[in-house]
């Protein structure tokens, strides 16, 4: 008995060939001996089967002795043994129809789970193997689960169903809803304008939801909301903004926030959360702000940084075009009695300068002591 695998929703063509290369009488029946279709001369006739409106044949092939049964919009329950009666012979074809669907939705939030469920006919024992867009293979039976979806899991998942040494392939497009970056860090000199951007890693026709930037300043004892907003069809409207700092928000995607000036009291870490319509859960992006200040107070030249810096970052004070006078893995460095000239405060990571602030030290004129 020939075995043919089909996919739910697809069209399948079951072949039946006569030895004579001419149009002769044929019938297709199911396992209950109910006639599906056949011919009467050059006319196609249909029986009382459930396939009535979905069954067809190719009249153009009858003259060549081919009498296929075409079943459109396959259903799992179409799985059956189909019998072609031609020239006093019977050809049996076993059709097994499978379906593979993703849980609830193919648009999933980063960190959520993807469950792929195989629909299969009773009595079958298929095995399934799926390959993710990043080349990861998962195997299973009726259900396959992938927990903690990552951005790289976005794309086409290719799943192969194996039954009776035959295989059928499914392709499912999965969109992982996430920000392009999980975390970002902005380095600014005191007083500079700060731009925060939160680009999304996906595109959809209509994007509706709401969000908030929650901020923990390094110098504050508790965290607080800096801004809340709504998103309607990719248009951003601010709901509530804190008095200090007075953030501004762009009206279009990507989500974009402007802090008028970087100040030490704003340095810290924020978490932008975005809730999307019809989705439970939220997208998150961490953002960090590091602020540098260089000051000269009497005979002390000081450079300080505030915010989340890694312990391997180096803070240095140097006179322009000279070797660093002081260089430490600390958040503040200073030079006593600095010589005149343009001093540079540098925050660097393995030699790469992340932030630089210049301060001019003027020469000090010693006034003669009066007799």
């Amino acid at each position: 008995k020939k075995v043919v695998l089909g996919k739910k929703g697809d069209t399948v063509e079951l072949t039946c060939t006569a030895s004579q290369k001419k149009s002769i009488q044929f019938h297709w029946k199911n396992s209950n001996q109910i006639k599906i279709l056949g011919n009467q001369g050059s006319f196609l006739t249909k029986g009382p089967s459930k396939l009535n409106d979905r069954a067809d044949s190719r009249r153009s092939l009858w003259d060549q002795g081919n009498f296929p049964l075409i079943i459109k919009n396959l259903k799992i329950e179409d799985s059956d043994t189909y019998i072609c009666e031609v020239e006093d012979q019977k050809e049996e074809v076993q059709l097994l129809v499978f379906g593979l669907t993703a849980n609830s939705d193919t648009h999933l939030l980063q960190g959520q789970s993807l469950t792929l469920t195989l629909e299969s006919p009773p009595g079958s024992s298929p095995s399934v193997q799926c390959r993710s867009p990043r080349g990861k293979n998962i195997q299973g039976g009726k259900t396959l689960s992938v927990s903690q979806l990552e951005l790289q899991d976005s794309g086409t998942w290719t799943c192969t169903v194996l039954q009776n040494q035959k295989k059928v392939e499914f392709k499912i497009d999965i969109v992982v809803l996430a920000f392009q970056k999980a975390s970002s860090i902005v380095y600014k000199k005191e007083g500079e304008q700060v731009e925060f951007s939160f680009p999304l890693a996906f595109t959809v026709e209509k994007l509706t939801g709401s969000g908030e930037l929650w901020w923990q300043a390094e110098r504050a004892s508790s965290s607080k909301s800096w801004i809340t907003f709504d998103l309607k069809n990719k248009e951003v409207s601010v709901k509530r903004v804190t008095q200090d700092p007075k953030l501004q928000m762009g009206k279009k995607l990507p989500l974009h926030l402007t802090l008028p000036q970087a100040l030490p009291q704003y340095a810290g870490s924020g978490n932008l959360t975005l809730a999307l319509e019809a989705k439970t859960g939220k997208l998150h992006q961490e953002v960090n702000l590091v602020v540098m200040r260089a000051t000269q107070l009497q005979k002390n030249l000081t450079c300080e940084v505030w915010g989340p810096t890694s312990p391997k970052l180096m803070l240095s004070l140097k006179l322009e075009n000279k070797e660093a006078k002081v260089s430490k893995r600390e958040k503040a460095v200073w030079v006593l009695n600095p010589e005149a000239g343009m001093w540079q405060c540098l925050l660097s990571d393995s030699g790469q300068v992340l932030l630089e602030s210049n301060i001019k030290v003027l020469p000090t004129w010693s006034t003669p002591v009066q007799p």
């Epitope: 939801g209 709401s210 908030e212 809340t228 709901k239 804190t242 008095q243 200090d244 439970t280 939220k282």
Partner: antibody, heavy 119, light 107 residues
Framework: EVQVVESGGGLVQPGGSLRLSCAAS????????MSWVRQAPGKGLEWVAN????????YYVDSVKGRFTISRDNAKNSLYLQMNSLRAEDTAVYYC????????????WGQGTLVTVSS | DIQMTQSPSSVSGSVGDRVTITCRAS??????LAWYQQKPGKAPKLLIF???SLQSGVPSRFSGSGSGTDFTLTISSLQPEDFATYYC?????????FGQGTKVQIK
């Protein structure tokens, strides 16, 4: 530790006035919106009014508009609710609440002060 | 004003039961929804904010879901200290409004 403590409740005749106060501590009061929420005996919660950090914006539920006034004194870390033309249906426990939670949630509640309007 | 309708108004359960409370908004409120727990003679306590995020210090048996107009609070395994009244509240537009409350009582 964040704390909000209400005071000023009591028995008042219909048509009378009362001023509720709320003393806040343990957080930077001037950085938060504040709300008053009430609960009539055996009933559910009803939001009454709120006020922006520096007091420039105030919102009220329709049933108290024109009768109640919310105000704050950031120098004293205090929130107030001036209630005039009181009615029997204003009888409730009044809670002072900080609107400091994420997604505009009401995160810290006082223990409440009971206002009884009766002749 | 946005009306918030909770159901059921009361539910009886035993320790270990799974309890689900629903809240429906008369118009879309995105995810501007919070859930509170109130015990007799006490002030309400914030459980869930932004429809689905758990407030710090709240046990993980509490969870929230939904967006738009339909929201759910689930207690996965009822504990003796969970017998209380639960309220949903919208923060989408003024005036903020609460649901009428759902009393969770011992069966």
């Amino acid at each position: 530790e964040v704390q909000v403590v209400e005071s000023g409740g009591g028995l008042v005749q219909p048509g009378g006035s009362l001023r509720l106060s709320c003393a806040a501590s343990g957080f930077t009061f001037s950085s938060y919106w504040m709300s008053w929420v009430r609960q009539a005996p055996g009933k559910g919660l009803e939001w009454v009014a709120n006020i922006k950090e520096e007091g420039s914006e105030k919102y009220y539920v329709d049933s108290v508009k024109g009768r109640f006034t919310i105000s704050r004194d950031n120098a004293k870390n205090s929130l107030y609710l001036q209630m005039n033309s009181l009615r029997a249906e204003d009888t409730a426990v009044y809670y002072c609440v900080r609107e400091g939670g994420q997604w505009l949630a009401l995160d810290y509640w006082g223990q409440g002060t009971l206002v009884t309007v009766s002749s | 004003d946005i009306q918030m309708t909770q159901s059921p108004s009361s539910v009886s359960g035993s320790v270990g039961d799974r309890v689900t409370i629903t809240c429906r908004a008369s118009q879309g409120i995105s995810s501007w929804l919070a859930w509170y727990q109130q015990k007799p003679g006490k002030a309400p306590k914030l459980l869930i904010f932004g429809a689905s995020s758990l407030q710090s210090g709240v046990p993980s048996r509490f969870s929230g879901s939904g967006s738009g107009t339909d929201f759910t609070l689930t207690i996965s395994s009822l504990q003796p200290e969970d017998f209380a009244t639960y309220y949903c509240q919208q923060a989408n537009s003024f005036p903020w409004t609460f649901g009428q409350g759902t009393k969770v009582q011992i069966k």
